[in-house]
Interface confidence: medium
């Protein structure tokens, strides 16, 4: 049967919900899937169920709620129906489903090289997603940076931070690294998608040599 797969708000001002629409062998024809929603009214859910305002904008098998339909102060209930019957139901508040867009504009700068010339430290910087209104305090994002050598499969994770830059220590010179960052709303459990990968190439020791050494 169809099931909700995810509801997500990228910026606390809109949200969308997605569902599966798999037809399994031996199941009866379910007919068209519709999404209905209602809002919490004290201990009881109001019986005023309304149909999805926009089945198109968030893609196939989805419902998009623009800012006119979204409020942070009100809990929502949504249900999927087919042939008049409910096939899945879920309830949430907008703040529980915040999953920010990926951080953007990743870049790095060299901090220093070890005396042995084997390791180097870099500073990685990025920007918050454009639609996250950080200045107003509308969103408070926590970032997680991951990095690995290009030929490795396992990512190393750094502790979550609230700033948009972080030093990465003891990278091996002569190796190429991949770095990626993702964010989540502080105190909520949903990380957003990762940023595009930033490639960090640390050149040979000789290229870091100070000019004075040649004289």
């Amino acid at each position: 049967e169809p099931k909700f797969t995810k509801c997500r708000s990228p910026e606390r001002e809109t949200f969308s919900c997605h569902w599966t629409d798999e037809v399994h062998h031996g199941t009866k024809n379910l007919g068209p899937i519709q999404l209905f929603y209602t809002r919490r009214n004290t201990q009881e859910w109001t019986q005023e169920w309304k149909e999805c305002p926009d089945y198109v904008s968030a893609g196939e098998n989805s419902c998009y709620f623009n800012s006119s339909f979204t409020s942070i102060w009100i809990p929502y209930c949504i249900k999927l129906t087919s042939n008049g019957g409910t096939v899945d139901e879920k309830c949430f508040s907008v703040d529980e489903i915040v999953q920010p867009d990926p951080p953007i504009a990743l870049n790095w700068t060299l901090l220093n090289v070890s005396l042995t010339g084997i390791h180097a430290d870099i500073q990685v910087r990025w920007e918050a997603p454009r639609n996250a209104d950080i200045q107003k305090g509308w969103m408070v994002l926590e970032y997680e940076l991951q990095y690995k050598e290009v030929n490795e499969t396992k990512w190393k994770m750094m502790d979550p931070i609230l700033t948009t830059s972080v030093p990465v220590y003891s990278l091996k010179v002569d190796k190429e690294y991949e770095v990626r960052v993702r964010s989540k709303q502080r105190n909520s459990g949903n990380y957003g998608e990762f940023s595009e990968v930033l490639y960090v190439t640390l050149p040979q020791m000789s290229q870091f040599t100070c000019e004075e050494d040649f004289y």
Partner: antibody, heavy 125, light 107 residues
Framework: EVQLVESGGGLVQPGGSLRLSCAAS????????IHWVRQAPGKGLEWVAY????????SYADSVKGRFTISADTSKNTAYLQMNSLRAEDTAVYYC????????????????????WGQGTLVTV | DIQMTQSPSSLSASVGDRVTITCRAS??????VAWYQQKPGKAPKLLIY???SLYSGVPSRFSGSRSGTDFTLTISSLQPEDFATYYC?????????FGQGTKVEIK
């Protein structure tokens, strides 16, 4: 018993600063948002700012944006309103009020609306 | 910001009268409207939330209703303790706004 108690009001010169406190008791502070609402003498109610201490969210009315800062200390169950660059038009009684955060409707009977208010503290600029 | 236009700004009524106060939102706010009562020198008190839900402990003579972006507070039979100022409030938007208030006075 749910209680909100404001303090920190007083007389201040234009351009000066003041910090208001709102001490909460009798409910789980993290499960609510705390709002500051003011009322100028003989006038109506004006919403000023709010903070959701669990998520760290804040928001401000345009009239105070950039001058006022709302914060909270969950260990003390207290919300604060730091008011800088005060103007004559900021003269008002300042109330703090609770609005349950909708994330918590699973755990308690959720209702919207500012259900508990402090007694108010007067700020004169 | 969403404007809440409240009317009338004041009214005179007698004990036992039916009193109606209206509020119009400048855009859709769903049912995210509350009504408050305030007496001089006191903090406001919540009467109605979600446009029509009666807050616990509030007498049943108070009721709220919604028609689109129009919201109504009705006091079915005015009592002496009901003479006060009443405010509507929308909490649909993250920037919460109040109506200008309606003062209910003794005729």
């Amino acid at each position: 018993e749910v209680q909100l108690v404001e303090s920190g009001g007083g007389l201040v010169q234009p351009g000066g600063s003041l910090r208001l406190s709102c001490a909460a008791s009798g409910f789980n502070f993290s499960y609510s948002s705390i709002h500051w609402v003011r009322q100028a003498p003989g006038k109506g109610l004006e919403w000023v700012a709010y903070i959701s201490s669990y998520y760290g969210y804040t928001s401000y009315a345009d009239s105070v944006k950039g001058r006022f800062t709302i914060s909270a200390d969950t260990s003390k169950n207290t919300a604060y309103l730091q008011m800088n660059s005060l103007r004559a038009e900021d003269t008002a009684v300042y109330y703090c009020a609770r609005l349950q955060h909708p994330s918590w409707y699973y755990y308690q009977g959720y209702h919207s609306g500012m259900d508990y208010w402090g007694q108010g503290t007067l700020v004169t600029v | 910001d969403i404007q809440m236009t409240q009317s009338p700004s004041s009214l005179s009524a007698s004990v036992g009268d039916r009193v109606t106060i209206t509020c119009r939102a400048s855009q859709s706010v769903s049912s995210a409207v509350a009504w408050y009562q305030q007496k001089p020198g006191k903090a406001p008190k919540l009467l109605i939330y979600s446009a029509s839900s009666l807050y616990s402990g509030v007498p049943s003579r108070f009721s709220g209703s919604r028609s689109g972006t129009d919201f109504t507070l009705t006091i079915s039979s005015l009592q002496p303790e009901d003479f006060a100022t009443y405010y509507c409030q929308q909490y649909w938007s993250s920037l919460i706004t109040f109506g200008q208030g309606t003062k209910v006075e003794i005729k």
